[in-house]
């Protein structure tokens, strides 16, 4: 039978060394014995590459291509294939699809003062343009009251956040998780990093008095 | 050490045919991209055809599209230009040189880094 | 198609001296930052051409720091300070950005 592309493949990069993209088929797939996505930079001299697609669900294909670090003028030329057959071609330019990696290594000291120190790792090393064009949004929750959650906005540069003791309930188990995003590239946000949990140890001052 | 060593070059008539060789060695030849360059007689140097390192993507001068054509064997880390109809202002040294690394993604520039000694083309009646 | 001009067409420069030739592209040749896809060569009488500078001001595998190289965008310049005789020859710029590739029409540099 004819095989049709239900959803155009969209396509996200990391700006460092992955570009992933994900299209959804007219049925289920076997997203690696059907189907090629080849990927050619629009530069002189450039080769054609081949990614071979991964199923994510029954008919949705997925395929992460290894690109150079990222700049501002790449323009790489896709073309979907299905043995012969030419399903889709399109476009695609990394620096206008930006999805950040996610940041790594999420954890909560105590600090002086009644205070939680949040900590994470940029997932950028230092010469990359986006580590310094990163801001994170970061999101503590109860695990027992869905509705006790708060969200924070880092904007400056250090990848911490100091959080209050009081403001959260005493004796509570809560959870953070933390994503980023760049503003300059209109990223989308990055996938939210692994949840961390701690215990609110703090005693509100009525019950010192 | 890297060579390039061009032969093929010979006195032809206008409208005939010649095939140029480039023989490479010291290096990964099927990585880079080979380039042709020629230069008539007391002119300046101008650029005639790129070839990939695969093979699968070739360009050309305006001057030549259509009758030359660059092709290359990996295997025996040879480059060739094959000239068509041949006219008096193909009259020239033609040399190869080594451009661009290919293999990677964004192919890796380096100018053309190294030159052939040329081999001399003469279209005459 | 993009278009090179060099300027001047022939220098005559005493040993010691420096030496400069400019190089003008019709479009700008950065592709990204620090990334201009600009080359110098240099063809000695009777010889090949040689490899001097690329990507702009970077230097070739055992070209002598004299030579140097600077500009970004569509203008450039080859600087040969501390003139030897050997230098003689003809000076070509080449851009390497996009098909058809080209070249400045040459700079003839003679020794005094």
């Known amino acids: 039978g004819s095989v049709k592309v239900l959803h155009e493949p969209s396509c996200f990069s990391d700006y460092i060394s992955t570009s992933v993209c994900q299209w959804k088929m007219d049925h289920p797939t076997n997203c690696s014995a059907e189907l090629r996505l080849s990927y050619q930079l629009d530069f002189m001299g450039s080769e054609n590459h081949t990614c071979v697609p991964e199923n994510r669900e029954d008919s949705v294909c997925v395929c992460s291509m290894p690109i150079d670090d990222a700049v501002e003028a790449d323009v790489y030329q896709l073309d979907l294939w299905a043995g012969q057959q030419l399903l889709w071609s399109g476009s695609f330019q990394p620096s206008k699809h930006v999805k950040p990696r996610t940041p790594g290594n999420l954890t909560v000291h105590p600090n002086i003062s009644h205070t939680w120190l949040l900590m994470w790792t940029n997932p950028y090393p230092t010469e990359n343009h986006l580590h310094s064009e990163l801001t994170y949004m970061v999101n503590v929750s109860n695990d027992n009251d869905p509705e006790d959650f708060k969200v924070y906005n880092v904007t400056y540069m250090g990848p911490t956040l100091r959080l209050a003791a009081s403001t959260l309930k005493s004796g509570a188990s809560y959870s953070a998780r933390v994503r980023a995003w760049a503003q300059t590239y209109n990223s989308t946000w990055s996938d939210w990093s692994p949840s961390t949990t701690w215990l609110n140890y703090y005693e509100p001052w009525e019950q010192h008095l | 050490e890297v060579q390039l060593v061009e032969s093929g070059g010979d006195l032809v008539k206008p409208g005939g045919s010649l095939r140029l060789s480039c023989v490479a060695s010291g290096f990964t030849f099927r990585d880079y991209a080979m380039t042709w360059v020629r230069q008539a007689p007391g002119k300046g140097l101008q650029w005639v055809s790129l070839i990939s390192g695969s093979g699968g993507k070739t360009y050309y001068a305006d001057a030549v599209k259509g009758r030359f054509t660059i092709s290359r064997d990996n295997a025996k880390n040879t480059l060739y230009l094959q000239m068509n109809s041949l006219r008096a202002e193909d009259t020239a040294v033609y040399y190869c040189?080594?451009?661009?690394?290919?293999?990677?993604?964004?192919?890796?520039?380096?100018?053309?880094?190294?030159w052939g000694q040329g081999t001399l083309v003469t279209v005459s009646s | 198609d993009i278009v090179m001009t060099q300027t001047p067409l022939s220098l005559s420069v005493s040993p010691g001296e420096t030496a400069s030739i400019s190089c003008r592209s019709s479009q700008s040749l950065l592709y990204s930052i620090g990334y201009n896809y600009l080359d110098w060569y240099l063809q000695k009488p009777g010889q090949s051409p040689q490899g001097l500078i690329y990507?702009?001001?970077k230097r070739a595998s055992g070209v002598p720091d004299r030579f140097s190289g600077s500009g970004s965008g569509t203008d450039f310049t080859l600087r040969i300070s501390r003139v030897e005789a050997n230098d003689t020859g003809v000076y070509y710029c080449m851009q390497g950005l996009q098909s058809p590739l080209s070249f400045g029409q040459g700079t003839k540099l003679e020794i005094k």
């Open positions: 990507l702009g001001s």
């Open positions: 040189a080594v451009d661009r690394l290919t293999k990677t993604i964004r192919p890796q520039y380096y100018g053309l880094w190294h």
